[in-house]
């Protein structure tokens, strides 16, 4: 087909020489020589679809997917990844080829998948498909640790079936609540697989390898604490092991603990008890409920009771498949230029999610915090008051979730002007979106109060940062205003800005900025 452009798709691998997150325009890294990805026309596809050779990337590597287009005239483009649109800024190289790039910094599982690039040129529209996967995903894994009872001993073994072999550590804390944060002095770490000291307040096991770190907390009911105000809930997938620890302290040894599922005592092989005297001579008992491989019928209320303490219960829910529950409706926010604000997503998920926040093709680390009610929350505050579209993406082994946010920053318009032989245009990105007025400056109206209404055309367009609206106003030149100074003013509830343009003057057009509060 004569009309089809000549397209070249390349992969650029980067050597990270900097831990900073770079913009797509200036790479914070050293580049290797580009690798040609072919980009062949895909047969039997509706529309014009080019397919690049599959790209395999090491975990944490940084790459650029690049398309070079040999087509006359301007091009516009849009990247789409996992149903999210990403901003696209084409530029031209020395051979006048259109260049479109997608930078992926520090490759993670979340960033693997299909990247679609839609290009519109003056002649035609076409799509380019890149498939990016992580190299050795079958070989490199990091699985959440789980617990097993050690044969013939009152001890727990922590197991993580990961490749490469992970370092396993127990993270122990004997304090309550906030002071059990990872870097707190109350936290003790033991780099071993077997744990004999099972009487602590908070017990977690963590496994780490090249892919990161995963932890599992030993679910605990403490009969000496008032029950939490929301139902404690534990999710497991069919086949996973169940471990719940019940702990109680009493002035003497004259008390016993029992576990029930719904209304029936747990069977003999599904619990074991340990007891010890604490420093103040009180007796601590713990009773573990465990099922080595759960089935659907292990779902229900598990109640730990004592002869000297009120009972407490937790709901164990066995699911076939993991899930992420959250509202995915997009949210719009409007804030002042110096207002403190964070995006937040509240979700319930099992297994634990991996997540990222994305803005203008840049990914940011995502932290999540567990709430008392079984939900978790992820907040993003590092927006630096940049307006536009922010994307939260979460996934676990079985589910994916994406939520879009739009941030608008209330500010006075700033006006930029440009002019040609036939028209003058003014642009502004203030928010709320400004309204426009045009005025003519003449002998009759030296203060430029004479309003121009003829030949004015206003529009809004999505420009600059993806999701940020820019308003523009264009004045078509007529004989009545040729050779005159005109003034365009953008105004919103926060103020007004104007720019003065001399129409039809020879050489470059002088612009006089005029700020009016």
């Amino acid at each position: 087909n004569q009309d089809l452009p000549v397209i070249k798709c390349v992969l650029i691998n980067h050597k990270n020489n900097d831990s900073s997150v770079g913009k797509s325009s200036s790479y914070p890294m050293v580049s290797e020589s580009p690798e040609d990805l072919g980009c062949a026309l895909r047969p039997q596809s509706s529309g014009t679809v080019y397919e690049a050779a599959a790209v395999e990337v090491d975990v944490s590597a940084s790459i650029t997917l690049q398309v070079l287009v040999d087509a006359p005239g301007n091009i516009s483009c849009l990247w789409v990844f996992k149903h999210s649109s990403l901003n696209c800024q084409p530029h031209f190289d020395l051979q006048n080829r259109g260049v479109v790039s997608m930078v992926i910094l520090k490759m993670t599982e979340t960033q693997a998948g299909e990247y679609l690039l839609f290009i519109q040129s003056e002649a035609t529209n076409y799509t380019i498909l890149f498939t990016v996967s992580i190299r050795n995903t079958l070989l490199y894994t990091l699985r959440r640790p789980y617990f097993r009872k050690m044969e013939n001993q009152d001890a727990l073994v922590c197991i993580s079936e990961s490749v490469p072999e992970p370092i396993v550590e127990w993270v122990l804390c004997d304090s309550q609540g906030e002071s059990c944060k990872e870097e707190s002095p109350a936290v003790v770490k033991k780099e071993e697989k077997v744990l004999h000291e099972l009487f602590g307040t908070d017990i977690r096991c963590c496994a780490r390898n090249e892919l990161g770190r995963e932890c599992t907390r030993l679910f605990t009911i403490d009969l000496n604490q008032t029950p939490q105000t929301t139902l404690p809930q534990l999710f497991l997938k069919v086949g996973e092991p169940l471990w719940i620890r019940c702990k109680a302290v009493h002035v003497n040894h004259g008390f016993g603990l029992t576990w029930e599922l719904e209304n029936k005592a747990l069977e003999e092989g599904n619990y074991f008890e340990m007891s010890t005297y604490s420093t103040n001579r009180t007796m601590i008992r713990i009773l573990f409920a465990f099922v080595s491989s759960v089935a659907r019928n292990d779902t229900g209320y598990y109640t730990c009771s004592s002869s000297k303490h009120p009972s407490q219960s937790a709901l164990v829910t066995i699911v076939e498949k993991g899930f992420i529950n959250a509202t995915n409706s997009s949210e719009d926010y409007e804030i002042d230029q110096y207002e403190e604000f964070c995006f937040s997503v509240r979700f319930k998920a099992y297994p634990q999610i991996r997540c990222t926040w994305t803005f203008s093709r840049k990914s940011f680390p995502c932290e999540q915090k567990g709430l008392d009610n079984g939900y978790s929350i992820s907040k993003f505050c590092n927006h630096k008051h940049q307006p536009g579209e922010y994307i939260f993406h979460a996934e676990n082994d079985d589910a994916q979730f994406t939520k879009m946010f739009t941030l608008n920053i209330r500010r006075k318009p700033q006006v930029l002007a440009e002019a040609s032989a036939s028209q003058a245009s003014c642009f502004s990105d203030g928010y709320p979106l400004p309204s426009w007025t045009w005025k003519k400056c003449s002998d009759k109206s030296p203060n430029c109060t004479e309003e121009i209404t003829e030949g004015v055309w206003n529009r809004k367009a999505n420009r600059k940062v993806f999701g940020q609206w820019v308003s523009s106003s264009t004045l078509n030149m007529s004989e009545a205003i040729k050779g005159f100074l005109v003034k365009c003013c953008a105004y919103n509830s926060l103020g007004t800005s104007c720019e003065t343009i001399l129409l039809n003057s020879p050489g470059p057009f002088p612009f006089i900025q005029d700020n009016i509060s």
Partner: nanobody
């Protein structure tokens, strides 16, 4: 779905009595139910509960004055409160199977 509904709270003079009820639905027995209370600005505390050997358990401040009982057939637990004192003023909550009722206000005037 477990639901617990308390009733019987109200305003009473010091030395008087009140009987609170907690009607439960979605549960299989009243064996593990308990009463807790929360006074303004204070932590929630145990008032009375059943234990796993069938006996009862009471918070130190109510021993000898309050009695917990139940009607298994109606899945209802009661709290008989006698010799009430102004410091018994609180919202009283029923607890069972990890769930809480909405609470019922008890106010003891001096």
């Amino acid at each position: 779905q477990v639901q617990l509904q308390e009733s019987g709270g109200g305003l009473v003079q010091a030395g008087g009595s009140l009987r609170l009820s907690c009607a439960a639905s979605g549960i299989f027995s009243t064996n593990h139910m308990a009463w807790y209370r929360q006074a303004p600005g204070k932590q929630r505390e145990l008032v009375a509960a059943f234990t796993n050997d069938g006996s009862t358990l009471y918070g130190d401040s109510v021993k000898g004055r309050f009695v917990i009982s139940r009607d298994n057939a109606k899945y209802t637990v009661f709290l008989q409160m006698n010799s009430l004192k102004p410091e018994d003023t609180a919202v009283y909550y029923c607890y069972g199977l990890g769930h809480w009722g909405q609470g019922t206000q008890v106010t003891v005037s001096s």
